[in-house]
């Protein structure tokens, strides 16, 4: 098992990358100057007891920043947020922390990172720009839910 | 508010099968998991396993794989736990505890009152 | 498998602070095994103090806390209380699997 993580860079098909804006993760188009973030991503080390074809189920977080995603509800309405945490302490939890998790699938080069807490809502921006990372539930309309994702070594 | 309601006390005899179970109530066990544990007289504690009840999938402690299967049915919020082929070593009180994660952690936070198993012939 | 070991009794008094404590067969206990604390009052009646070593569930009394002290897990209660007679377990993660202490049995007369 691999134990610690792997670090990426995240776009989505408009070329627009996650930087951080006031503890909020947000998609803007690349520009020189802009520094944006770098993924921590790590499987989950609990795989066998969660399910199998949905994608790698994966912590996560902004390298160097003790910040993960997360899943939770807002009233009925499930929301992206970020919290202080660290990934490898999620990672070593006896049991998958599923407001943590999301199940990854690849397509090519296209990811896609699906709550595991929430099945059916997507890591997700809208096509507009400069807007916060949200979940959603509606593919291929208003928002992206398709990045690409460029592992660095 | 939250409970687990265990099922009454057992009388059974060595080799049979039986079938324990909790009931959640003030949460849907959807959204945690269930974890089994064994009381003996004067032996302390022994966890036995757990089912995540969102998709069924169980872990066990080694020695209890092949003497206890863990269910759960979500429509009536509730989680089995069968015991198998029946010893006196069985002889115990078990409990069901919801194993929860509260933001930094998780915790053995509520239990069950405990179904007491006796087998004796 | 891992074997772990609490004092069987400790005695103590109200206002008293007092330590429990959790070793572990195969080493010093560490973050890594998520050391959590639950109370067995009697008729079989359990409640969840601490959980991941040192973290407190909502409704748990302050005057619980859990920590590392030397190469163990240990409880601390700040303050006892007549209602905290008990017995007390700990339970220590192994990587896959969960093994708990025999229990001390905790008087505050």
């Known amino acids: 098992k691999i134990d610690t993580p792997q670090r990426g860079s995240i776009q989505d098909i408009n070329h627009r990358v996650w930087v951080l804006q006031d503890q909020t993760l947000i998609a803007v188009p690349r520009k020189d100057r802009m520094s944006p973030v770098t993924i921590a991503l790590i499987s989950c080390r609990h795989v066998e007891t969660l399910e199998k074809d949905r994608g790698n189920p994966i912590y996560l977080g902004l390298n160097g920043l003790n910040l993960c995603l997360m899943c939770a509800k807002v009233g009925d309405q499930p929301t992206l947020q970020l919290k202080e945490k660290d990934i490898m302490d999620l990672y070593n939890q006896p049991e998958p922390v599923k407001s943590f998790l999301f199940y990854h699938s690849q397509s090519g080069r296209n990811s896609t990172f699906e709550s595991v807490a929430f099945p059916g809502w997507f890591i997700a921006v809208s096509s507009e720009g400069g807007c916060p990372l949200i979940l959603t539930q509606e593919l291929g309309k208003a928002n992206t839910t398709d990045f690409g994702l460029t592992m660095l070594f | 508010e939250v409970q687990l309601q265990q099922s009454g006390a057992e009388l059974v005899k060595p080799g049979a099968s039986v079938k324990l179970t909790c009931t959640a109530s003030?949460?849907?066990?959807?959204?945690?998991?269930i974890y089994w544990v064994k009381q003996r007289p004067a032996q302390g504690l022994e966890w036995i396993g757990r089912i995540d009840p969102a998709n069924a999938y169980t872990k066990f402690d080694p020695k209890f794989q092949g003497k206890a299967t863990l269910t759960a049915d979500t429509s009536s919020n509730t989680a089995y736990l069968q015991l198998s082929s029946l010893t006196s070593e069985d002889t115990a009180v078990y409990y069901c505890t919801r194993f929860h994660w509260y933001g930094s952690s998780f915790f053995f936070d509520y239990w069950g009152q405990g179904t007491t198993l006796t087998v004796s012939s | 498998q891992a074997v772990v070991t609490q004092e069987s009794a400790l005695t103590t008094s109200p206002g008293e602070t007092v330590t429990l404590t959790c070793r572990s067969s195969t080493g010093a206990v560490t973050t890594s095994n998520y050391a959590n604390w639950v109370q067995e009052k009697p008729d079989h009646l359990f409640t969840g103090l601490i959980g991941?070593?040192?973290n407190r569930p909502p409704g748990v009394p302050a005057r619980f806390s859990g920590s590392l002290i030397g190469d163990k897990a240990a409880l601390t209660i700040t303050g006892a209380q007549t209602e905290d007679e008990a017995i007390y377990f700990c339970a220590l993660w192994y990587s896959n699997l969960w093994v708990f202490g025999g229990g001390t049995k905790l008087t505050v007369l």
């Open positions: 991941g070593t040192d």
């Open positions: 003030g949460f849907n066990i959807k959204d945690t998991y």
